[in-house]
C-alpha cells in the first residue's frame, strides 16, 4: 500500500511534439513525487526535481521515449521516499513514416469468427505494435517478418466479440530503438456483425432506376437501433445515418443516393450508439440496377 502507481494521460503512445501527463498516485494520498527514466536518452528536466501530483512532459522528442518510474514522498519511510512505482513505457511516434493496416478477409467480422490484421511497410521494421483506440494498456508487440520489399506482420484475432471490436492502428519500430515508433497507420475500424436480428432494406421509387434518377434506400427494423449503416458490395466504407421512429413503430433511416449512374448490391446494418463497433446481421442484399447505362455494377 506504500508503493505509488504511475500512469500516463492520455496514454503511453505519444506523437512527437505533443505532451503527455505523468501522474504518480500514492494510495495514502502523498502528493509529492520524483521521476526517473531507466533507459534510452537522459531527460534533464526530471533530475533533482520534486513534482506535485502530476508532470506535464513535452513537447515530446525521441529522447523522451523509454521506461519511467516514480517514488512518492513518504514521511513514514526512513529515506522519506516510497518504493519505486510500476514501470511506464513511453513510446514516441512519428519517427518513421507510417505503415499500412488491412483486415483479411475484411473489417466486418461475424461474431465468433476470426480476422487477420496485416500491418505492412516498405520500411524494414523488426517490430510492429498494434493499438486499439481508447485502451490505456500497452499496445500489443508483434515480431515483423523482414523481406526485400520491407516488412509485415499478420495477427490473427478472434473469436470476434464486441470487446475486440474497435478502431485499430499499427506502428513500426526498429530493434535498437524499440520505443521510437513510426507515425500511426491510418485507422482501421473492426466491426463485429451478427449480434442482433437483421433490418430490412428497400428502395424508393424501386430497385431499378433510369441513369441519373434519384433513388433512396430505406433501412428499417422494429429493434431500437440508434444508427443504420449502408454498405455497397466491393466498396470500402459505409454511409451512416441516425434512426428515426416511424408512426408504424419501426426505426428507420433513409439514405438518399442522389442521381445514380451505376448500380450494385447494397446491405444495411443496425447498431446502438453505446456500442458503435457492434452491428446487427446484414439485411438481405438489395440489388440496385441502373438502366440506360452500360455499367450495371
Amino acid at each position: 500500500q506504500d508503493k505509488p502507481f504511475l500512469s500516463a494521460w492520455p496514454g503511453t503512445v505519444v506523437s512527437e511534439g505533443q505532451h503527455v501527463t505523468l501522474q504518480c498516485r500514492s494510495r495514502l494520498g502523498f502528493n509529492e513525487f520524483s521521476l526517473s527514466k531507466e533507459d534510452g536518452m537522459p531527460v534533464p528536466e526530471l533530475y533533482n526535481r520534486i513534482f506535485r501530483n502530476s508532470f506535464l512532459m513535452g513537447p515530446v522528442t525521441p529522447a523522451h521515449a523509454g521506461t519511467y518510474r516514480c517514488c512518492s514522498s513518504h514521511p513514514h519511510s526512513p529515506t522519506g521516499w516510497s518504493a519505486p512505482s510500476n514501470p511506464v513505457v513511453i513510446m514516441v511516434t512519428g519517427v518513421h513514416r507510417k505503415p499500412s493496416l488491412l483486415a483479411h478477409p475484411g473489417p466486418l467480422v461475424k461474431s465468433g469468427e476470426t480476422v487477420i490484421l496485416q500491418c505492412w511497410s516498405d520500411v524494414r521494421f523488426e517490430r510492429f505494435l498494434l493499438h486499439r483506440e481508447g485502451i490505456t494498456e500497452d499496445p500489443l508487440r508483434l515480431v515483423g517478418q523482414l523481406h526485400d520489399a520491407g516488412s509485415q506482420v499478420n495477427y490473427s484475432m478472434g473469436p470476434m466479440t464486441p470487446a475486440l471490436a474497435g478502431t485499430y492502428r499499427c506502428f513500426g519500430s526498429v530493434t535498437h530503438l524499440p520505443y521510437e515508433l513510426s507515425a500511426p497507420s491510418d485507422p482501421l475500424d473492426i466491426v463485429v456483425v451478427g449480434l442482433y436480428g437483421k433490418p430490412s432494406l428497400s428502395a424508393q421509387p424501386g430497385p431499378t432506376v433510369q441513369a441519373g434518377e434519384n433513388v433512396t434506400l430505406s433501412c428499417s427494423s422494429r429493434s431500437l437501433f440508434d444508427i443504420y449503416h449502408l454498405s455497397r458490395e466491393a466498396e470500402a466504407g459505409e454511409l451512416r445515418l441516425t434512426a428515426v421512429l416511424r408512426v408504424n413503430g419501426t426505426f428507420q433511416a433513409n439514405f438518399p443516393l442522389g442521381p445514380v449512374t451505376h448500380g450494385g448490391n447494397y446491405r444495411c446494418f443496425g447498431s446502438f450508439r453505446a456500442l458503435p463497433h457492434a452491428w446487427s446481421d446484414p439485411s438481405d442484399p438489395l440489388p440496385v440496377s441502373v438502366t440506360g447505362n452500360s455499367r450495371h455494377l
Partner: antibody, heavy 122, light 97 residues
Framework: QVQLQQSGPEVVRPGVSVKISCKGS????????MHWVKQSHAKSLEWIGV????????NYNQNFEGKATMTVDKSSSTAYMELARLTSEDSAIYYC???????????????WGQGTSVTVSS | LLVSAGDRVTITCKAS??????VAWYQQKPGQSPKLLIY???NRYTGVPDRFTGSGYGTDFTFTISTVQAEDLAVYFC?????????FGGGTKLEIK
Amino acid sequence: QVQLQQSGPEVVRPGVSVKISCKGSGYTFTDYTMHWVKQSHAKSLEWIGVISTYNGNTNYNQNFEGKATMTVDKSSSTAYMELARLTSEDSAIYYCARERGGDGYYSAVDYWGQGTSVTVSS
Amino acid sequence: LLVSAGDRVTITCKASQSVINDVAWYQQKPGQSPKLLIYYASNRYTGVPDRFTGSGYGTDFTFTISTVQAEDLAVYFCQQDYSSPYTFGGGTKLEIK
C-alpha cells in the same frame, strides 16, 4: 459480500474523547486502505484522512491533525478513529470507507460503513 | 433540482485547478451512506445502471441521468481524488415532482 460495520451512536460531553470502530468483512482487510469521512450539515462531506491497513501508515487532512487519530488492528480486521477534545462543531456522522481497487491504482471509495453519529452536548 | 420522472438531468462540478480525470460521483439517498456511481470521471462502477454517466477532464465535469426515475431521489456529490486532502462538492439534491 463486502461489509463495513461501524460502532453505534455516541452522545458525549464537550472536552472528552471518543473512539469509533469500523470492522471489515467479506474481503482481505489488509489489501485496501481505509478512509474516514465526516458529514455535517454545516460542511457537507469532509475527508479526514486515510490509513494503510497493512502497516498503519497515515495521511491526515491538515484540518483534522490533532483532532483525529486513525489506527488499525489487523488481527480483528478493524479500523479505529479517535476524536479528541470534542466540541459542538464535531457533532456529525463519521463514515469509514474502503478504497476502490482493481486496476493497479486504487481510486475513490466504493464501500462505506453505515456511519456513526457523534453528538457533543453538555 | 426539482425534476419530473423521465427528465434528463445534468449536474456540473468545477475544480479550482486541473484534476486530470480523478473525479468520482456519489449518490446518497435519505438516511443512507453514500454510494459510488462513477470513478475516473466517466467509468461506471459495477452494477450502476447505464442511465448514469459522467464526463469531463481537467477542471469541468458533468454527471448526467438520462431518464430520471423515482428511486433517483437523492443528493449527488462529486469528489476529487487527484490531490490530498481529497475534497467533495457541496452536493446537489434531486427532488422528484
